[in-house]
């Protein structure tokens, strides 16, 4: 059948070939393709100043595949649009458009701001942060012996990191400052600085809860955590100092 | 050279069918795409549909509901019907031919019937 | 559906002149656009299609030219059996549509 649309063509375009290339189903020296095999898509290609007929199994970027009974064809996408599903859904738009429901946009919409990685019109993202995690060892110097007024840090991490137009994060460490009873260095002790030093039993003179001076930067509502550690720690200290008293009466 | 001859009744009365019959010489139906186009009487043209080598058809949304292009092969012809006309069904009615997005579009053509829809 | 507006809707040309009709579509229709003459009761010649090419047997004088969404006819030099209507028709996708025509007669 198709050696014969060729053949009657040959009346109409005596140029046309019988024997045509692959995919063609009628074809010219001059045009080309001028009709395609069943399920294969007709689209000019420019080569030079010269438009030729092929026939092609999918559409080239910029176009889309059209289905039309018996006579299939790529079509254009618009012409805002590089890469498109049909002529009405876009999936990647041309440079300085950006992509919005199947829609390339100069300016995203109300609500929306352009992702210039995507060329995409996203939600607004603001910043997340984690609630605080609890505040560090009083240290002074990066020491948390020799000294009786230091400081206290404690931080938050980033959950979410805010869109071009999103809320910007808060701050995500905090520094107060803090009282503890003075407490001799010992020999080697490095007493190092937060969660890389050994959490132990506070020494005697050692105090794990934090007394902020009255001075301190920014204190917080105390949590029931924060409150049920401080309780623990002054019962701590209420039991190193009887086990001391203990300790010296044998000593004599 | 390929040649298509229009006919049927020149006038129908609303409500009824138009029919009209596209007999084709120089070229069998059984390749190709076969069509038909009207126009109205102040010279505005309106594609209506064809039918292919194969026997598949398409029609304009605008008349889908209304039109059937069918075809018989043994006598080399093709076939309009339009359901339920209205005098806006009036028009020259035309048979046309192309092969290809390639080639020339409508190559040939019928030389046309007039068709008035009146009571 | 894609509209073709063609411009002028009629003209007089004295004969020998460089005439030009033109066709915009409403969207780009990628060279899929064909150019044919009506004279009166008879049918109509296709003379141009994809968007340059002449048909078989037409003579030389009549050209296309265009891209995207702007096409035009010239016809170099008229001669008096070129007065009638001419048409442009895209067939970028289905349904195909016609332009409203150019009336051209001869000064």
């Known amino acids: 059948q198709n050696a014969s649309r060729g053949r009657r063509q040959r009346r109409m375009h005596p140029n046309v070939s019988q024997g045509c290339q692959g995919g063609c189903a009628t074809c010219s020296d001059y045009n080309g393709c001028l009709s395609c095999k069943p399920r294969l898509f007709f689209v000019l290609e420019r080569i030079g100043m010269k438009q030729i007929g092929v026939c092609l199994s999918s559409c080239p970027s910029g176009y889309y595949g059209t289905r039309y009974p018996d006579i299939n064809k790529c079509t254009k996408c618009k012409a805002d649009c590089d890469t498109c599903f049909n002529k009405n859904f876009c999936t990647k738009c041309k440079s300085g458009f950006y992509l919005h429901l199947g829609k390339c946009l100069d300016n995203c919409p109300e609500g929306l701001e352009a992702n210039n990685h995507t060329m995409e019109c996203v939600n607004i993202v603001h910043c997340e942060v984690s609630e605080w995690n609890p505040w560090s060892p009083c240290t002074k110097k990066g020491k948390t012996c020799g000294f009786k007024r230091g400081t206290e840090t404690r931080v938050r991490e980033i959950m979410q990191h805010p869109s071009a137009k999103g809320n910007l994060c808060p701050p995500t460490n905090e520094t107060r400052k803090c009282t503890v009873q003075r407490k001799k260095c010992q020999k080697g002790e490095r007493g190092k600085k937060g969660r890389e030093r050994k959490r132990k039993k506070p020494n005697k003179g050692e105090s794990k809860e934090a007394i902020p001076d009255s001075k301190g930067l920014e204190s917080s509502k105390e949590t029931p955590e924060q409150r049920e550690n401080k309780q623990q720690q002054k019962k701590r200290k209420v039991q190193d100092k009887q086990q001391k008293s203990v300790s010296v009466s044998t000593v004599h | 050279e390929v040649q298509l001859q229009e006919s049927g009744p020149s006038l129908v009365k609303p409500s009824q069918t138009l029919s009209l019959t596209c007999s084709v010489t120089?070229?069998?139906?059984?390749?190709?795409?076969w069509n038909w186009i009207r126009k109205f009487p102040g010279n505005k043209f309106e594609y209506m549909g064809y039918?292919?080598?194969?026997?598949?058809?398409y029609q304009n949304p605008s008349l889908k509901s209304r039109i059937s292009i069918t075809r018989d092969t043994s006598k080399n012809q093709y076939h309009l019907q339009l359901n339920s006309v209205t005098t806006e069904d009036t028009a020259t009615y035309y048979c046309?031919?192309?092969?290809?997005?390639?080639?020339?579009?409508?190559?040939?053509w019928g030389q046309g019937t007039l068709v008035t829809v009146s009571a | 559906d894609i509209v073709l507006t063609q411009s002028p809707s009629s003209m007089y040309a004295s004969l020998g002149e460089r005439v030009t009709i033109t066709c915009k579509a409403s969207?780009?229709?990628?060279?899929?656009l064909s150019w044919f003459q009506q004279k009166p009761g008879k049918s109509p010649k296709t003379l141009i299609y994809?968007?340059?090419r002449l048909v078989d047997g037409v003579p030389s004088r009549f050209s296309g030219s265009g891209s995207g969404q702007d096409y035009s006819l010239t016809i170099s030099s008229l001669e008096y059996e070129d007065m009638g209507i001419y048409y442009c028709?895209?067939?970028?996708?289905?349904?195909?549509?016609f332009g409203a025509g150019t009336k051209l007669e001869i000064k």
């Open positions: 994809l968007t340059n």
């Open positions: 046309a031919t192309y092969y290809g997005y390639g080639g020339p579009w409508f190559a040939y």
């Open positions: 120089g070229d069998s139906i059984t390749s190709g795409y």
């Open positions: 039918i292919s080598y194969s026997g598949k058809t």
């Open positions: 969207q780009d229709i990628d060279s899929y």
């Open positions: 028709l895209h067939y970028d996708e289905f349904p195909l549509t």
